[in-house]
């Protein structure tokens, strides 16, 4: 706590200006009126206050607004935002996308801090859902943002917001997250024609079920190996050799290099060796000729 001392004669601040950088900590505390500071927050960023002085200014705002800052102040916090704790931010009610952008700009180039994560959480909860404009903004600042959300949180993303998602935004998503996002993407892009649809849906395919992969195999999409390797193993296993060949098109040759890795390895084990040989890639490990394949999962379902 800063001791309460009287402001020296002639030092009372009439406005927030650069003369304040010469004030000692106690002088700032004593001579700057919190209400004046609140109305002139936009000036703070143009003045090279030290970190110590910013601590004093924050303290003054905390005293003025013990229940949390109003949005008119939050919007102009600028670098003072970096001084806020998640506890401070939980008291805020941020509704304007412009305010969110202004604060994200301050943290630009840095990893997502606990403060930023709390701010985003407060903003999204206040809006009720992750709308397209918000998602656009968040992924522009933090490409990995979407993949930091839980499947439950992702369920509040409306399909219309999926248009804002770029392939790199999904780089760190795990299968559980893609399971939630894929149906939304499928819905969002449903009116596009074949080739355009595939370009848009490609990065979401880690959440696609077998029947959708079978459908894609009929559309000459030429899926690349990188995308194929990210598909759900359980969705790939039921595909026939002919379906995989159609799905990959000229990229089918890449299976050889990936034959020891999932899902290719597991898929090979489920195919007849005769069928694998038709690819002419030298893939080994399929079911030998003359062996009978029992689908035990089917039998269990019937009983």
């Amino acid at each position: 706590e800063v001791e309460k001392t009287a402001c020296p004669s002639g030092k009372k601040a009439r406005e927030i200006d650069e003369s304040l950088i010469f004030y000692k900590k106690w002088e700032l505390e004593a001579c700057v009126d919190a209400a004046l500071l609140a109305t002139q927050m936009d000036r703070v960023n143009a003045i090279p206050f030290t970190y110590e002085q910013l601590d004093v200014l924050k303290h003054k705002l905390d005293e003025l607004y013990p229940q949390g800052y109003p949005e008119s102040v939050i919007q102009h916090l600028g670098y003072l935002f970096l001084k806020m704790s998640p506890e401070d931010i939980r008291k805020w009610n941020v509704t304007s996308l412009e305010t969110l952008k202004a604060l994200l700009e301050v943290n630009k180039g840095h990893e997502m801090s606990p403060q930023v994560a709390t701010l985003i959480d407060r903003f999204v909860k206040g809006r009720g859902q992750l709308d397209k404009d918000t998602l656009d903004t968040l992924t522009a600042f933090y490409p990995g943002y979407l993949c930091s959300l839980s499947p439950e949180e992702l369920s509040s993303v409306p399909p219309s917001s999926i248009w804002a998602v770029r392939p790199q935004d999904l780089d760190t998503c795990d299968p559980r997250q893609l399971d939630v996002l894929y149906p939304k993407a499928r819905l969002a892009f449903q009116n596009m024609n074949g080739s355009e649809y595939f370009v848009k849906i490609q990065s979401f395919l880690g959440g696609a079920p077998t029947e959708d992969l079978k459908a894609l195999s009929q559309q000459n999409v030429s899926m690349d190996l990188a995308t194929f390797m990210k598909l759900r193993t359980d969705a790939v296993l039921p595909l026939t050799v002919a379906e995989v060949q159609k799905l990959l098109g000229p990229h089918v040759e890449g299976l050889k290099a990936e034959e020891r890795h999932r899902p290719v390895r597991d898929w090979i084990l489920r195919q007849r060796q005769d069928d694998l040989d038709t690819l002419g890639l030298g893939l080994q490990g399929g079911i030998p000729n003359g062996y009978l394949v029992l689908d035990l999962s089917m039998q269990e379902a019937l009983s």
């Epitope: 090279p48 206050f49 030290t50 970190y51 110590e52 670098y79």
Partner: antibody, heavy 122, light 107 residues
């Protein structure tokens, strides 16, 4: 990349004025995100921060120093300068110019000049 | 003003040694502490900022830690090019102040 180079007389007589210039190359002195500093080191002693100038022209000199320093900016030449009038032997030191990072407040000195030795002697 | 006290003022070490330098501030400076390397006739070099953030291009054998008043610079395995003088500096309040340096010499 950005480089800083100090220049000025190596020898100054007592009571005269010391003028040093720091030339910035590879970047603009008037771009935001940085501030420009002078630092000195007396022979065998600690580093001592003299003061800064911001691209906006705001200056701050170390109030703990006995000497009166003036720091100025010449954006047309991409230079900033240090002036010290009425020098004494106590001002003999290696003088460095340095660029400071601004991370919401003035912060670390990320690029320095090699330093220039100034001797005050008659 | 904030006083910065560095220790030791000098040390002798061999290549491959682990070296630790400490810096103490006269008041709480949070994590606003920077470390520099100085070699005669060369431009000083920023090694670490904000107590523990390694500056780009600085080898990972350098690391920093601490918060509040007590800080440490560690060189995990000393290399021939690391023999120099190291300074800490606080950027919490003006006037900015430095420690008086630690000279790392060859044993």
């Amino acid at each position: 990349q950005v480089q800083l180079q100090e220049s000025g007389p190596g020898l100054v007589k007592p009571s005269q004025t010391l003028s040093l210039t720091c030339t910035v190359s590879g970047g603009s002195i008037s771009s935001g995100g940085y501030y420009w500093n002078w630092i000195r080191q007396h022979p065998g002693q600690c580093l001592e921060w003299i003061g800064y100038i911001f691209y906006s022209g705001i200056t701050y000199s170390n109030p703990s120093l006995k000497s009166l320093f003036t720091i100025s900016l010449d954006t047309s030449k991409n230079q900033f300068s240090l002036k010290l009038s009425s020098v004494t032997a106590a001002d003999t030191a290696v003088y460095y110019c340095a660029r400071g990072l601004v991370r919401g407040a003035p912060d670390a000195f990320d690029i320095w000049g090699q330093g220039t030795m100034v001797t005050v002697s008659s | 003003e904030i006083q910065m006290t560095q220790s030791p003022s000098s040390l002798s070490a061999s290549v491959g040694d682990r070296v630790t330098i400490t810096c103490q501030a006269s008041q709480d400076i949070s994590n606003y502490l920077n470390w520099y390397q100085l070699k005669p006739g060369k431009a000083p070099k920023l090694l670490i900022q904000a107590a523990s953030s390694l500056q780009g291009g600085v080898p990972s054998r350098f690391s920093g830690s601490g918060s509040g008043t007590d800080f440490t610079l560690t060189i995990s395995s000393l290399q021939p090019e690391d023999f120099a003088t190291y300074y800490c500096q606080q950027s919490y309040s003006t006037p900015f102040t430095f420690g008086c340096g630690t000279k790392v010499e060859i044993k």
